[in-house]
């Protein structure tokens, strides 16, 4: 039961995480205009990975895509790549993990195959989460660097009393969505890996026991521990010899504690 719960929860957490990564990637608020120095602006600027937007005090919002590929900073391209890789890996991981779920029966899939699929999806989720966290962190670092650079030359005099206020950008909502989503995907991946350990078949070799009955002899040979799908009994994998019975979910079931920051 604990394995099913861990696997199911890992899947759900990863699903939420990947949805968050997709949302963060599509969001326009990766960087937002810092209003600390200019709280009275009637024009609010914010930027995403794909376009930059301006919201005027009337509520009118105008967005312009980055229609150049070569003219964009290498760091921005790297962040885009990391986020896309994260989404792709996460999507594949989700697809694999659906078939690996213990509560879903697909033909006569071996438990070892389900365990392998669970481990594969878990690793994919971990890498996906790391990609998202890395992407968001790279962008955040870029913002911090630019913020202090623009602070250093905040006002550039243009002769006499004329001043040009340089627009500074700070962390946007997408960064926080990305960090949380990446973290959730990572946690979901770890949970899947933990669940995999419980799904792996336990190769227990019992000695054959012979019972000599009158007239004929029958040898009962135990089959290994085979995990059923949870929907009814699987006669093919039925355990004949009961040497201290344990339910499938009790095998390799370790309680895990996750700290959410």
């Amino acid at each position: 039961m604990a394995v099913t719960a861990c696997q199911g929860l890992g899947f759900v957490v990863s699903l939420i995480g990947i949805a968050g990564i997709i949302a963060a990637t599509c969001m326009d608020q990766w960087s937002t205009q810092d209003l600390y120095n200019n709280p009275v602006t009637a024009v609010f600027n914010y930027q995403g990975l794909w376009r930059s937007c301006v919201r005027e005090s009337s509520g009118f919002t105008e967005c312009r895509g980055y229609f150049t590929l070569l003219g964009l900073p290498a760091m921005l391209q790297a962040v885009r790549a990391l986020m896309i890789v994260g989404i792709v890996l996460g999507a594949i991981g989700l697809l694999v993990s659906i078939f690996a779920l213990k509560c879903i029966r697909i033909g006569s899939m071996e438990d070892s195959a389900k365990a392998n699929m669970t481990l594969t999806s878990g690793i994919m989720f971990i890498v996906s989460g790391l990609c998202a966290i890395a992407g968001v962190s790279v962008f955040a670092n870029m913002l911090v660097t630019n913020f202090w650079m623009s602070t250093a030359n905040m006002y550039t005099g243009m002769g006499g009393m004329v001043q040009t206020v340089q627009t500074r950008y700070t962390f946007g909502a997408a960064l926080f969505v990305g960090w949380v989503a990446g973290g959730l995907t990572l946690i979901g991946g770890v949970m899947m890996c933990i669940a995999c350990r419980g799904l792996a078949p336990e190769e227990t070799n019992y000695k054959a026991v012979s019972y000599h009955a009158s007239g004929h002899s029958v040898a009962y040979k135990p089959g290994g521990f085979k995990a059923s799908t949870g929907f009814g009994s699987n006669t093919k994998n039925k355990k004949i010899y009961d040497g201290g019975a344990r339910t499938e979910d009790e095998v390799q079931s370790y309680p895990s504690k996750h700290d959410y920051v």
């Epitope: 009275v40 009637a42 024009v43 930059s52 005090s57 009337s58 001043q163 206020v165």
Partner: antibody, heavy 120, light 113 residues
């Protein structure tokens, strides 16, 4: 047709308060911010503040903060500008002006103006 | 606050001639996010409220004759009336639309010579 119709002229004593109304018609009242601007006799234009009829959000010129209050009545599509502690230098024509949606923060329609005279 | 300074204070131009009004702001009105200038020009005739002529420094409001042209960027802006008509006699104001408080120039009175 967009119309902003303001209340009539007022004569007030120093220290008193005045409340000027501006009734909007011809457009969706809650979709456009309303600004207030004043013009002293023979002088230039001075921005007082604005009210967002959608959420009742306001922003005031620091010069008038504490003395001016902008309110709105959605049921009658009317905005109000109340100026308290009147002084003789508050004698001016007060205009309400609608902030255009795609006019780069410029005011596209103006009321006819309300003359407020502060005199003892 | 952004200070808007117009020049000249008054201007007399012959009918059919070109009229040029300048406006200078103490801070740039160019928004880096969209490379647009947040400056408007208004025309005010005696006893009337101001009328929007130009917004975004160079975009004519609908219904405004094409003899009115706005130009400039950053801190220096110009309103040009290519061929002055009798009905153009008015006071013209430039306005900062970029930062609060919105501020206006002192006005330029345009008359016929």
């Amino acid at each position: 047709e967009v119309q902003l119709v303001q209340s009539g002229a007022e004569v007030k004593k120093p220290g008193a308060s005045v409340k000027v109304s501006c009734k909007a018609s011809g457009y969706t009242f809650t979709s456009y911010i309303m600004h207030w601007v004043r013009q002293a006799p023979g002088q230039g234009l001075e921005w007082i503040g604005y009210i967002n009829p959608y959420n009742d959000g306001t922003k005031y010129n620091e010069k008038f903060k504490g003395r001016v209050t902008l309110t709105r009545d959605k049921s009658t599509s009317t905005v109000y500008m109340e100026l308290s502690s009147l002084r003789s230098e508050d004698t001016a024509v007060y205009y309400c002006a609608r902030l255009g949606f795609t006019t780069r923060n410029a005011m596209d329609y103006w009321g006819q103006g309300t003359l407020v005279t502060v005199s003892s | 606050d952004i200070v808007m300074t117009q020049s000249p204070d008054s201007l007399a131009v012959s009918l059919g001639e070109r009229a040029t009004i300048n406006c200078k702001s103490s801070q740039s009105l160019l928004n880096s996010g969209n490379q647009k200038n947040y400056l408007a020009w208004y025309q005010q005739k005696p006893g009337q409220p101001p009328k929007l002529l130009i917004y975004g420094a160079s975009t004519r409001e609908s219904g405004v004759p094409d003899r009115f042209t706005g130009s400039g960027s950053g801190t220096d802006f110009t309103l040009t009336i290519s061929s002055l008509q009798a009905e153009d006699v008015a006071v013209y104001y430039c306005q900062n639309d970029h930062s609060y408080p919105f501020t206006f120039g002192q006005g330029t009175k345009l008359e016929i010579k």
